[in-house]
């Protein structure tokens, strides 16, 4: 387990090996107190498949940089992204895809087909989410890719498209 | 509240009844430090409605056995399952169903209809998730049933189909 | 950070300012021990767009009143609602909408279009969920609006329609 989970915990307090159940600072230092979280809404103007986010959202123990959430404390993170699509159906079906990327590698994706009847309709709403539970190291980047980003309606739904992470456990 | 939440906490330290606010070990032993979690991906070859999972996933304080997650520490758990379907549409609609079972009882299900136009198309993607917040006792089993398991495409989407649990609170 | 996070922690124990790493009660009082949660199923008989919930569900540190969850401890909350719809398709498409309201203001919504082929079918299932991570103050209300509440089939799916919240961190 990590031993730096208490802010301002001095390094000169020794941690006993093995059973430290009566060494209270030892117990405390091993306890999973650390909390890190983020909750960002999608940027107003999207112009590429890698989504950008409003950096004035909730950020605590996580940095935002160039479309990435950057992890500052290692541990087990719960990551969840939810997107709201509004599709003007062409005369063929459309596959909506949401990719969660960790360090520019696809970690998990969600796909849904809309407009499957092949009829041109006024509009079709679709909501897509993806979650992940994963160990992340310091400076790991978390990002989201959507090939059909033009269907993310940021003007009608400015609050609906979010990327969120929170640290569940900073112990191994 | 559980009293064994600190690893290696000796049984011979008495817990005061009532207000133990100045008995630090008492406080610590009652504090919700315990963390248990699992994140398993679906097994490559599915041949029955009860899904099997890759036991080499993330498992901490939870066991995997015969398609079940088996709880080892009692408490309030957040349970979430997400599945990615790929359906070759027949000439009728298809109902996709995901059932979360606790001790072999259906606790929660999610259903979505696809191929509703009744047209035979090449393929339709659908993503389905289900969550649960529930008190689980030691040896409680968590499992997932999918009637239409043949539509879970484990070769194209080996990472997308997951069952995850994590202990939120080990106090009552 | 909040200083009342240990139940029964006496007020007469002073909290040192600055580095309190060796003042164990200080550390404990600042630690995010507080846990609050709720998991409620939808009421059997719905007759308005603001959903009502069965108050005999799981409630801990959160109150239920008149369709609202009422927050009792300030902090960062994870809020999630999931609904199961069963739609008898008319001869036009139907937009299903789920709104999460904080203090009667729409905070987040999810929309999905069903029956998009415009064909009258026997039934179409659709599952819709919405989550939120937000700082909530004492007496904040959390509620859910569904315009098409008549499609929430509480008799077939009494367990599927839920509203859940849990406190992630009571620190700022």
């Amino acid at each position: 387990q990590r031993t730096d989970s208490i802010p301002n915990s001095p390094d000169n307090i020794p941690l006993r090996g093995g059973n430290c159940s009566e060494d209270l600072l030892c117990i405390l230092k091993r306890a999973p107190f650390k909390k890190s979280w983020a909750y960002l809404q999608v940027a107003k103007h999207l112009n590429k498949t890698k989504l950008s986010w409003n950096k004035d959202g909730i950020l605590h123990g996580v940095r935002y940089q160039d479309g990435n959430l950057v992890i500052q404390f290692p541990g087990l993170y719960f990551i969840i992204c939810q997107l709201q699509f509004l599709v003007q159906c062409p005369n063929n079906s459309v596959d909506l895809k949401l990719e969660l990327l960790i360090n520019k590698h696809i970690k998990k994706q969600a796909l849904v087909t809309v407009c499957e009847s092949g009829m041109q309709t006024k509009h079709v709403y679709q909501n897509l989410s993806q979650f992940l539970l994963d160990y992340l190291q310091v400076n790991t980047t978390v990002s989201v890719n959507v090939d059909t980003f033009q269907y993310i309606d940021t003007s009608t739904f400015p609050l609906e498209n979010v990327l969120s992470v929170f640290l569940y456990s900073n112990s191994d | 509240q559980r009293t064994d939440s600190i690893p290696n906490s000796p049984d011979n330290i008495p817990l005061r009844g009532g207000n133990c606010s100045e008995d630090l070990l008492c406080i610590l032993k009652r504090a919700p430090f315990k963390k248990s979690w699992a994140y398993l991906q679906v097994a490559k070859h599915l041949n029955k409605t009860k899904l099997s999972w890759n036991k080499d996933g993330i498992l901490h304080g939870v066991r995997y056995q015969d398609g079940n997650l088996v709880i080892q520490f009692p408490g309030l758990y957040f349970i979430i399952c997400q599945l990615q379907f790929l359906v070759q549409c027949p000439n009728n609609s298809v109902d996709l169903k995901l059932e979360l079972l606790i001790n072999k009882h259906i606790k929660k299900q999610a259903l979505v209809t696809v191929c509703e136009s009744g047209m035979q198309t090449k393929h339709v993607y659908q993503n389905l998730s289900q969550f649960l917040l529930d008190y689980l006792q030691v040896n409680t089993t968590v499992s997932v049933n999918v009637d239409t398991f043949q539509y879970i495409d484990t070769s194209t989407f080996p990472l997308e189909n997951v069952l995850s649990v994590f202990l939120y609170s080990n106090s009552d | 950070q909040r200083t009342d996070s240990i139940p029964n922690s006496p007020d007469n124990i002073p909290l040192r300012g600055g580095n309190c790493s060796e003042d164990l009660l200080c550390i404990l009082k600042r630690a995010p021990f507080k846990k609050s949660w709720a998991y409620l199923q939808v009421a059997k008989h719905l007759n308005k767009t603001k959903l009502s919930w069965n108050k005999d569900g799981i409630l801990h540190g959160v109150r239920y009143q008149d369709g609202n969850l009422v927050i009792q401890f300030p902090g960062l909350y994870f809020i999630i609602c999931q609904l199961q719809f069963l739609v008898q398709c008319p001869n036009n498409s139907v937009d299903l909408k789920l709104e999460l309201l904080i203090n009667k203001h729409i905070k987040k919504q999810a929309l999905v279009t069903v029956c998009e082929s415009g064909m009258q079918t026997k039934h179409v299932y659709q599952n819709l969920s919405q989550f939120l991570l937000d700082y909530l103050q004492v007496n904040t209300t959390v509620s859910v609006n569904v315009d098409t509440f008549q499609y929430i089939d509480t008799s077939t799916f009494p367990l599927e329609n839920v509203l859940s919240v849990f406190l992630y961190s009571n620190s700022d």
């Epitope: 498949t49 360090n103 520019k104 970690k107 890719n145 959507v146 090939d147 | - | -």
Partner: antibody
Framework: QVQLQESGPGLVKPSETLSLTCTVS????????WSWIRQPAGKGLEWIGR???????NYNPSLRSRVTMSRDTSKNQFSLKLSSVTAADTAVYYC??????????????????WGQGTTVTVSS | QSALTQPASVSGSPGQSITISCTGT?????????VSWYQQQPGKAPKLMIY???KRPSGVSNRFSGSTSGNTASLTISGLQADDEADYSC??????????FGGGTKLTVL
């Protein structure tokens, strides 16, 4: 070790359908992703599409309206059909196995095994 | 999808190092760590030399290395040898779950 062999007619008339088959030996077609790539004389490579073990497909957007890929697990083969061909479709056509790992995340690692290629000429 | 941009030709003397660039977009090279490089001798099928930006398949000399910066990938060959003379093509996975290749670069060993 996996080996690939393309086969099919070397000459196709304009407006007709080009049909090629790739036979896989040394491995199961159900275990990997399979791609078709072409290369006009003196030009660069162009990716046509891929077929997964499940039978689902991804196609190059510029060719999507004309391409169909399928597989036959009993024969350990996958095939390419390109409709309404023109002289611009004249090229060497390669089938290839995609190197994909999925231990922790998706490792899309390119094409690690190629057939020797077959020349297709579109001419009347 | 547009082809990735590579120089038509590069050259170098034996023992030297050369670098071939491959420019894409934020939807391919700049998005993923899924860039590959191929060597193609005349009349032969391509051979995978680098995958996932900088990894080498077994059997490929460590004289071959890859990197990316922004939307541009690079292949560097150090200690140039006569039998390195060939066409080199880059490839990248794209946001639409497809692959895109570069136009190819002819390497001449002087």
């Amino acid at each position: 070790q996996v080996q690939l062999q393309e086969s099919g007619p070397g000459l196709v008339k304009p407006s007709e359908t080009l049909s090629l088959t790739c036979t896989v030996s040394g491995g199961s077609i159900s275990s990997y992703y399979w791609s078709w790539i072409r290369q006009p004389a003196g030009k660069g490579l162009e990716w046509i599409g891929r077929i997964f073990a499940s039978g689902s497909t991804n196609y190059n957007p510029s060719l999507r309206s004309r391409v169909t890929m399928s597989r036959d697990t009993s024969k350990n083969q996958f095939s390419l059909k390109l409709s309404s061909v023109t002289a611009a479709d004249t090229a060497v056509y390669y089938c290839a196995k995609e190197r994909v790992g999925v231990q922790d995340y998706y490792h899309y690692s390119g094409m690690d095994v190629w057939g020797q290629g077959t020349t297709v000429t579109v001419s009347s | 999808q547009s082809a990735l941009t590579q120089p038509a030709s590069v050259s170098g003397s034996p023992g030297q190092s050369i670098t071939i660039s491959c420019t894409g977009t934020s939807s391919d090279v700049g998005l993923y760590n899924y860039v590959s490089w191929y060597q193609q001798q005349p009349g032969k099928a391509p051979k995978l030399m680098i995958y996932e930006v900088s990894k080498r398949p077994s059997g490929v000399s460590n004289r071959f290395s890859g990197s990316t910066s922004g939307n541009t990938a690079s292949l560097t060959i150090s200690g140039l040898q006569a039998d390195d003379e060939a066409d080199y093509s880059c490839s990248s996975y794209t946001s639409s779950s497809t692959w895109v290749f570069g136009g190819g670069t002819k390497l001449t060993v002087l």
